[in-house]
């Protein structure tokens, strides 16, 4: 049967390919739970770390500068970019029906939690997404520390602040700065960028079972680790690519159910810093060692 579908409502059609939407959502959930899962579930602490790393764990003070100073004195610890050292997928792209780009074989471990990371619009605790795959993996850090020399000062007691510097018309540079906290961990073995080997183990959850594909040597748990410089970061998907990768048409409005399919990809993209570029110091027009926002939408 053809894959495209149409909504049964007057003057409304939708090109959603539900098979692709489900598989792609599962893929992104798998990435997130691989990074933040613990014992095959997303603990409150793991969930807290995810929120922390996507920058919504606490109120942040934002400063927007309208002077055109192109060389603010920003410093980052580039060793601790917020990228996973084993979860990069530059080819994870699909087009409307099934353009066959590989996801790569990133096997993750886990059982099934009932709830997707994006909440339902109309559902109880049973959850929306039966495909959430959880697993083990090291956590993505905030930047270890940073100094800033900006006109509007921020209270030294504030743990995290977000600073926008207007570098040129319509362009902003985002830096999230976090003072180091006691007890931050630096895992010893974080250099491997290869996916886990496929070794079958079995686990059972309340409602279903997952036989896990685990690696023999997984990245040790920790909040911070560095990324290999030769890795390709996950591609920054704009709106069209997000839709087509989930088998959705780009010319029609999204309803809540369709948007729900996109939630894990959006979170994964934020968490992986897919749309931030660690710019070269050679580029005079851009402040050194600054994460710039790609024009993705």
């Amino acid at each position: 049967f053809p894959q495209t579908t149409e909504k049964i409502s007057p003057n409304w059609e939708s090109g959603i390919n539900v098979d692709l939407a489900i598989s792609t959502r599962q893929y992104h959930l798998q990435q997130l739970f691989y990074r933040y899962g613990e014992n095959n579930s997303l603990s409150v602490e793991g969930f807290r770390k995810l929120l922390q790393n996507i920058g919504i764990d606490k109120i942040k003070r934002i400063h927007i500068h309208h002077d055109h100073d192109h060389h603010s004195d920003h410093e980052h610890h580039s060793d601790h970019e917020r990228h996973s050292d084993h979860e990069h997928h530059s080819e994870h792209e699909h087009h409307s029906d099934h353009d066959h780009h590989s996801h790569h074989n990133h096997a993750a471990s886990g059982k099934n939690k009932r709830k997707a990371l994006c909440p339902d619009h109309d559902s109880d605790s049973s959850g929306k997404d039966p495909r959430n795959s959880q697993g083990k993996g090291a956590h993505r850090p905030e930047h270890a520390s940073g100094r800033r020399n900006v006109k509007d000062s921020v209270s030294a007691s504030e743990v995290t602040s977000t600073v926008y510097n207007t570098v040129s018309e319509g362009t902003h540079f985002l830096e999230t700065i976090e003072t180091p906290r006691p007890g931050k961990l630096f895992p010893k073995d974080v250099s491997s960028s290869t996916p886990p080997s496929v070794t079958s183990k079995s686990r059972v959850s309340r409602l279903a079972g997952r036989k896990t594909n685990e690696s023999v040597s997984e990245p040790r748990k920790g909040f911070m680790y560095s990324r290999n410089t030769n890795e390709n970061p996950q591609e920054c998907f704009n709106a069209s690519k997000l839709l087509t990768s989930h088998g959705m048409g780009i010319q029609v409005p999204l309803n809540a159910t369709e948007f729900n399919y996109l939630c894990p990809a959006i979170i994964n993209q934020i968490d992986a810093r897919s749309c931030l570029i660690h710019t070269s110091e050679k580029k005079a027009e851009i402040p050194p060692k600054t994460y710039s926002l790609q024009i993705a939408w």
Epitope: F1, S23, H94, H98, S123, V198
Partner: antibody
Framework: QVQLVQSGGGVVQPGRSLRLSCTVS????????IHWVRQSPGKGLEWLGV???????DYNAAFISRLTISKDNSKSTVYFQMNSLQAEDTAIYYC???????WGQGTLVTVSS | EIVMTQSPATLSVSPGERATVSCKAS??????VVWYQQKPGQSPRALIH???YRYSGVPDRFSGSGSGTDFTLTISSLQSEDFAVYFC?????????FGQGTKVEIK
């Protein structure tokens, strides 16, 4: 054209294992998950499990102890193995892509001595 | 597991008439429901997904509605080729579960 072609099945003795194959064309196993469902007169349609794009598997808890789903992406083939079959496992077994659109032709498995 | 209960088990309808099949979930499944048609000796054919989306190629006399726990498949004007067994399935929670089927037969 999307197709799922199943092979294997037939008569299996009680206590023995069943191995089925599902070879797909028209799409990639790195893009879509493949589900297994069975249908019997007594129990109707039962979802058994799925293998996702990255190789992870989710199983119906009722079958996890004796079910293994694997795949070979290069061969575009998914493998289904169920151990310790009993008479009540007699059914038509289907592979399917996603919860909906494309199903294999089904293969009848009869567990009998 | 979520139990999907279909009613009626058998529906006797004359050609040209409307047929309505009901499916009730034992807990909220949002709109994660698909409807299948199955004819003897054939694999199930998906008609509707996400409770109310019709696959292209499926005649517009088939429609689906509902969310949460109550779902309905409606065939507005039965044609001879529509006499078959219809199943609902939820894919909100593991294990994905099916209704027991509703046989739509000629009256």
């Amino acid at each position: 054209q999307v197709q799922l072609v199943q092979s294997g099945g037939g008569v299996v003795q009680p206590g023995r294992s069943l191995r089925l194959s599902c070879t797909v064309s028209g799409f990639s196993l790195t893009t879509y998950g493949i589900h297994w469902v069975r249908q019997s007169p007594g129990k109707g349609l039962e979802w058994l499990g799925v293998i996702w794009t990255g190789g992870t598997t989710d199983y119906n808890a009722a079958f996890i102890s004796r079910l293994t789903i694997s795949k070979d992406n290069s061969k575009s083939t998914v493998y289904f193995q169920m151990n310790s079959l009993q008479a009540e496992d007699t059914a038509i077994y289907y592979c399917a892509r996603g919860p909906s659109s494309y199903w294999g032709q089904g293969t009848l498995v009869t567990v009998s001595s | 597991e979520i139990v999907m209960t279909q009613s009626p088990a058998t529906l006797s309808v004359s050609p040209g008439e409307r047929a309505t099949v009901s499916c009730k979930a034992s807990q909220n499944v949002d709109t994660n429901v698909v409807w299948y048609q199955q004819k003897p000796g054939q694999s199930p054919r998906a008609l509707i997904h996400s409770a109310s989306y019709r696959y292209s190629g499926v005649p517009d006399r088939f429609s689906g509605s509902g969310s949460g726990t109550d779902f309905t498949l409606t065939i507005s004007s039965l044609q001879s080729e529509d006499f078959a067994v219809y199943f609902c399935q939820q894919y909100n929670n593991y294990p994905w579960t099916f209704g027991q089927g509703t046989k739509v037969e000629i009256k």
